[in-house]
Amino acid sequence: QPPPPPPDATCHQVRSFFQRLQPGLKWVPETPVPGSDLQVCLPKGPTCCSRKMEEKYQLTARLNMEQLLQSASMELKFLIIQNAAVFQEAFEIVVRHAKNYTNAMFKNNYPSLTPQAFEFVGEFFTDVSLYILGSDINVDDMVNELFDSLFPVIYTQLMNPGLPDSALDINECLRGARRDLKVFGNFPKLIMTQVSKSLQVTRIFLQALNLGIEVINTTDHLKFSKDCGRMLTRMWYCSYCQGLMMVKPCGGYCNVVMQGCMAGVVEIDKYWREYILSLEELVNGMYRIYDMENVLLGLFSTIHDSIQYVQKNAGKLTTTIGKLCAHSQQRQYR
Amino acid sequence: SAYYPEDLFIDKKVLKVAHVEHEETLSSRRRELIQKLKSFISFYSALPGYICSHSPVAENDTLCWNGQELVERYSQKAARNGMKNQFNLHELKMKGPEPVVSQIIDKLKHINQLLRTMSMPKGRVLDKNLDEEGFESGDCGDDEDECIGGSGDGMIKVKNQLRFLAELAYDLDVDDAPGNSQQATPKDNEISTFHNLGNVH
């Protein structure tokens, strides 16, 4: 083993290095000292380090480590953050277009149902957006509310437009009849299935991306333990105390230290791998009724079909509802 | 399979959109993201090595620092001596992860479970048991595009294509002007929505 080079007789070099870390402080001894108070850079002989310097080195080492960790994750973090934003915006655009398609369908095919239909369609797609973003809304409730709200308007405007004003206040009865008589056939059920499946998958996809960001942020801002700080100090800075300014840590030694410092973080690895593979599996399944774009952009057509179904059965329905809702009375201002 | 009568269009103008050779759909963007994410699959296990390679480490020098002294790069002491009489590395590892790391691991476990539950087997088609009422739902086969809805003879496919174009080529405005008679509705063989969302590379 080569003999250690003689320490800087005046600690001058160490001082100029340390000044860069802590300008203006007189913590560096003029000449090498025994360093019996040192706790990290334990000297084999005289040393150019003091206890205060050691503390500063520890702080710097931990800061360096945090910066290295942040630069390590920068590309990954950017990838997920940007994609999460892009997909969220894309999903919002899909919802907006789906709403516009549906409104256009009402406007062009059933003008007498607007503006009420616009209002219900607007509310429905508001809930769709809120659901995707994580709101605790039930998809079945949204779909039921859409058809419950639409049917009274369809009945009074399309099926029975000649109703006298006195008979117009039968919404309660018509809403009830909507489900009891299955006036839209199985279309509401079809829409529920398609919408709930596609939105669930979309929502979990966005949740997963946002959790990915949270994982990176968590490990990005980890505060390293004192023990780790000491190990890093010994690796990066203790050589300075002996005047060895240009010497670098051994590669194997660095790996051992890093594994020690990152033992906790590395435990994420197993779950991170599983996260990416599970996300891949989800993405591979996002098609047909598990693809919200496909489902929502086709909703206008399914709703159109459902109204046509009502119209096809209008004769039978009008008779049944006429009997069922004959006793509905007008609401009074009390 | 959505039937659309001719009188759907108040405005008979047909919107012509230039064919996009490599249209970027939402699903293609999702797959692209997954491919990029997969290149980071070993991110956490590779972190210690990554940080060593991005901090000053003796690569070409003959001598290196092992925490206590200057040693030859390939000697036994290069990795071992620096740890002696210092901190018990094994103990440091045994302490377990920080509470915040444990918390994030729990969240990952939870989302992984959700993702697995939600992941659908390939080739699954629209549930057939919805047809109990006997309305004409159109028999949706194993086509590339799911057919949606149902009655009638004029079939259009709803293609999955939210395209990321350089410009917003087409945007419906019922939203802002319910009374606008210049309203167009999807027609012909596909429904496309266009928007510029910028590229993520």
Epitope: E123, N138, D141, N144, S149, R175, G176, D180 | -
Partner: antibody
């Protein structure tokens, strides 16, 4: 005609649970949600929760652990239950039908109210 | 939670007068979908509240046209063009833009 009729005890002890039944007529519980609101001199009107036509429920986060709303569609009845009532839960409790769109709606018809005093 | 503040607490009027009640919310009631979910109720003495106005300005079925609502964002007003005896009672504003729904403290409309 739309009506909501409430029934329940006026006096409740803290050890018991507070239960009120709302019986509706003129509409079906399979197509309308029913909300619960209370009114006290100290707190004014306070929204407690709702049961939707599907049977799904939403509660005020402050009271979620103590509240339960259930219903029987065939009997047109909605059941409100609050566990471990305290003195400051004394109030007039109202059920009301949801008008408008789900949680962005309003109460278009109200029950007559049930005055509840919690006292040991 | 969104705090709803009503002014005045008490409003003495003569029959036939115009009355105006103000309601202010601690945050905007304009929903991301463009709608504003602000409603007005009237509670007559010893009775349950009744819905008067929903979504800022829509009169509920059977409500006389002397009642009108207006406002936007965080400031709203209920106006009664000519007060009648049956209009006396406590008026409440309420919002359903944000969960939980919240109510104002009430404004008592009474005879001078």
């Amino acid at each position: 005609q739309v009506q909501l009729k409430q029934s329940g005890p006026g006096l409740v002890q803290p050890s018991q649970s507070l239960s009120i039944t709302c019986t509706v007529s003129g509409f079906s519980l399979t197509s309308y949600g029913v909300h619960w609101v209370r009114q006290s001199p100290g707190k004014g009107l306070e929204w407690l929760g709702v049961i939707w036509s599907s049977g799904n429920t939403d509660y005020n986060a402050v009271l979620i652990s103590r509240l339960s709303i259930k219903k029987d569609d065939s009997k047109s009845q909605v059941f409100f239950k609050m566990n471990s009532p305290q003195v400051d839960d004394s109030a007039i409790y109202y059920c009301g039908r949801n008008g408008g769109w789900l949680l962005r709606g309003f109460m278009d018809f109200w029950g007559q109210g049930t005055s509840v005093t919690v006292s040991s | 939670d969104v705090v709803m503040t009503q002014t005045p607490l008490s409003l003495p009027v003569s029959l036939g007068d115009q009355a105006s009640i103000s309601c202010r919310s601690s945050q905007s009631l304009l929903h991301s979908n463009g709608n504003t979910y602000l409603h007005w109720y009237l509670q007559r003495s010893g009775q349950s509240p009744n819905l008067l106005i929903y979504k800022v300005s829509n009169r509920f079925s059977g409500v006389p046209d002397r009642f009108s609502g207006g406002g936007s964002g965080t400031d709203f007003t209920l106006k009664i063009s000519r007060v009648e005896a049956e209009d006396l009672g406590i008026y409440f504003c309420s919002q359903s833009t944000h969960v939980p729904w919240t109510f104002g403290g009430g404004t008592k409309l009474e005879i001078k």
